[in-house]
Interface confidence: low
């Protein structure tokens, strides 16, 4: 098993039934406030629109959003913290017809309604303060 480079950027084609699976571990303890960020971009560029933005402030909160025409939309926040300090996690994002279903370590975590068509997602970027051991897209 080898580590993937972070930021990890991958070209994708998503549709209903697709699952994005991310396995990793926070680089530092939660006291040092590590973050995880996953962005579903509509182009192979970091400044493109984001259909789904998922950001973990480890030990604190999770924020979800979308970005259109360089403008962030209404932020959704969850204080539920399913990630464990120092522990490996498996984050799965299932593409359903009307929403993304986020799973953490096999447990349903949050449903985020589609704001931008899934068919427009061209790239997924995983980054910030994690080591990344797995990135997989299954259709």
């Amino acid at each position: 098993m080898s580590l993937l480079s972070v930021p990890h950027t991958e070209s994708v084609s998503l549709s209903t039934g697709s699952t994005v699976t991310i396995k990793g571990r926070p680089l530092v303890c939660f006291l040092n406030e590590p973050h995880l960020q996953v962005d579903f971009h509509t182009e192979m560029k970091e400044d493109s629109d984001i259909a789904f933005h998922f950001q973990v402030y480890f030990g604190n909160r999770v924020v979800m959003n979308s970005r259109e025409f360089k403008i962030w939309k209404e932020e959704v926040e969850s204080k539920n913290m399913p990630f464990q300090d120092g522990q490996e996690f498996e984050l799965s994002i299932l593409v359903l017809e009307d929403k993304y279903q986020v799973m953490v370590n096999g447990q349903a975590y949050y449903n985020f309604n589609h704001r931008i068509p899934v068919s427009s997602v061209k790239m997924v970027q995983v980054w910030r303060d994690i080591s990344l051991t797995k990135f997989n897209v299954s259709n």
Partner: nanobody
Framework: QVQLVESGGGLAQAGGSLRLSCVAS????????MAWFRQAPGKEREFVAA????????YGADSEKGRFTISRDNAKNTVYLQMNSLKPEDTAVYSC???????????????WGQGTQVTVSS
């Protein structure tokens, strides 16, 4: 620009130990992830271990688990590789590398030392 200089290599007996050091100098040298790689004659470069800039997380090649330990002292801008229970197959040139990414992929590291030879005799 970051300069990396390794030391601590040499001849060791099988079952013995060596501690390699890598001193980093240059602007913001302490903010880079650091890694050790090795290359034996006629073989591909091989990942050994990596450590984050804060030293908060380390990662080692599965084959070396329990024998090799990477650590760092940012006050001295030095990264160490403690190698125990050495085997003849550990014979190689060991190089340290620095970069912004924390990974086992050698292509992600921008800065490299010249390397230090480790020879393990049976």
């Amino acid at each position: 620009q970051v300069q990396l200089v390794e030391s601590g290599g040499g001849l060791a007996q099988a079952g013995g130990s060596l501690r390699l050091s890598c001193v980093a100098s240059g602007r913001a040298a302490g903010t880079y992830s650091m890694a050790w790689f090795r290359q034996a004659p006629g073989k591909e470069r091989e990942f050994v271990a990596a450590i984050t800039w804060a030293g908060g997380y380390t990662y080692g090649a599965d084959s070396e688990k329990g024998r090799f330990t990477i650590s760092r002292d940012n006050a001295k801008n030095t990264v160490y590789l403690q190698m125990n229970s050495l085997k003849p197959e550990d014979t190689a040139v060991y190089s340290c590398a620095g970069g912004r990414l924390f990974t086992s992929q050698s292509s992600a590291y921008q800065y490299w030392g010249q390397g230090t030879q480790v020879t393990v005799s049976s």
